[in-house]
């Protein structure tokens, strides 16, 4: 159901395109899977089997207008934010001060973008400036990949396959972001 069979309005499917936008702060209203009441697992996905199909991640979505300075897209767009835990992380207790925290050991599974759509949008600008077209890249699906421990964690492996794809000189980005930085990145990531 949906976009796989319906490619129009100047879109194309682009697998595996580089970096991806982080979730905007507005998505906090969606229930996440990394909650204590679920033991860090999404509901209805207990990960009791080793089946690859059990390793799934959550595709949250958001809607926005594409902006470029004072210019704004004539139509809004929608895309996915890849979220959640991809598998049964092995947890070890660690004491910090009086409390405990948990860290995963073993392979690190990440829910990351799998496919992108290239979308041509028309930007409308104030002050009588002529509209201009711009191509943006929007996340269209997510996938679980395994982050290996080799090469300074620079490789991501497709879950269930052995073929590793080196990521070209990318440094891992810190997860904590301010709302403003997040929004700025979302608006300027294209």
């Amino acid at each position: 159901q949906g976009w796989q069979a319906f490619k129009n309005d100047a879109t194309e499917i682009i697998p595996e395109l580089g970096e991806y936008p982080e979730p905007p702060p507005e998505l906090e209203n969606n229930k996440t899977m990394n909650r204590a009441e679920n033991g860090g697992r999404p509901p209805h996905h207990p990960f009791e089997t080793k089946d690859v199909s059990e390793y799934s991640c959550r595709e949250l979505h958001f809607t926005r207008y594409v902006t470029d300075g004072p210019c704004r897209s004539a139509k809004p767009v929608t895309e996915l934010v890849c979220s959640g835990q991809c598998g049964p992380a092995r947890l070890l207790p660690n004491a910090i001060g009086r409390g405990k925290w948990w860290r995963p050991s073993g392979p690190d599974f990440r829910c990351i973008p799998d496919r992108y759509r290239a979308q041509r949008v028309q930007l409308l600008c104030p002050g009588g400036e002529a509209p201009r077209a711009r191509k943006v890249r929007l996340v269209a699906s997510c996938k679980c990949k395994r982050l290996t421990r080799f090469h300074n964690q620079s490789e991501l492996k497709d879950f269930g396959t052995e073929a590793a794809r080196p990521q070209k000189g990318r440094k891992p980005r810190p997860r904590a972001r301010s709302a403003k930085a997040n929004q700025a990145e979302l608006e300027n990531a294209y």
């Epitope: 595709e59 979505h61 809004p76 929608t78 996915l80």
Partner: nanobody, 118 residues
Framework: EVQLVESGGGLVQAGGSLRLSCAAS????????MGWFRQAPGKVREVVGS????????YYADSVKGRFTISRDNAKNTMYLQMNSLKPEDTGVYYC???????????WGQGTQVTVSS
């Protein structure tokens, strides 16, 4: 193309509630997400929120979080916008639209007027 028809708008006092409906017909298989948008007089159209049809995952603009709720009825091919604790600044024409994931909202309804009086 997806045909969209909004209904349920009207005049309501501040603090009151309204429920808008958006009925979809036509090539509904081609829509993954449906959204609500609004346009106040003299202002640009803004996002209210949206719902992913497959799993009912919702997204809301900050200005309506906690007051508005989007839901959908698969059997009726209809999306709803429950608006509570309405404010005068919620006044405007409310539109529903449909999109495919990773695309633009290309299919739009004709809009329904919501007026919140103080």
């Amino acid at each position: 193309e997806v045909q969209l028809v909004e209904s349920g708008g009207g005049l309501v006092q501040a603090g009151g509630s309204l429920r808008l409906s958006c009925a979809a017909s036509g090539r509904t298989f081609s829509r993954d997400v449906m959204g609500w948008f609004r346009q106040a007089p003299g202002k640009v159209r803004e996002v209210v929120g949206s719902i992913k049809w497959s799993d009912a995952n919702t997204y809301y603009a900050d200005s309506v979080k906690g007051r508005f709720t989007i839901s959908r009825d698969n059997a009726k091919n209809t999306m709803y916008l429950q608006m509570n604790s309405l404010k005068p600044e919620d006044t405007g024409v409310y539109y529903c639209a449909a999109a495919i994931i990773g695309g633009t909202y290309n299919d739009w309804g004709q809009g329904t007027q919501v007026t919140v009086s103080s």
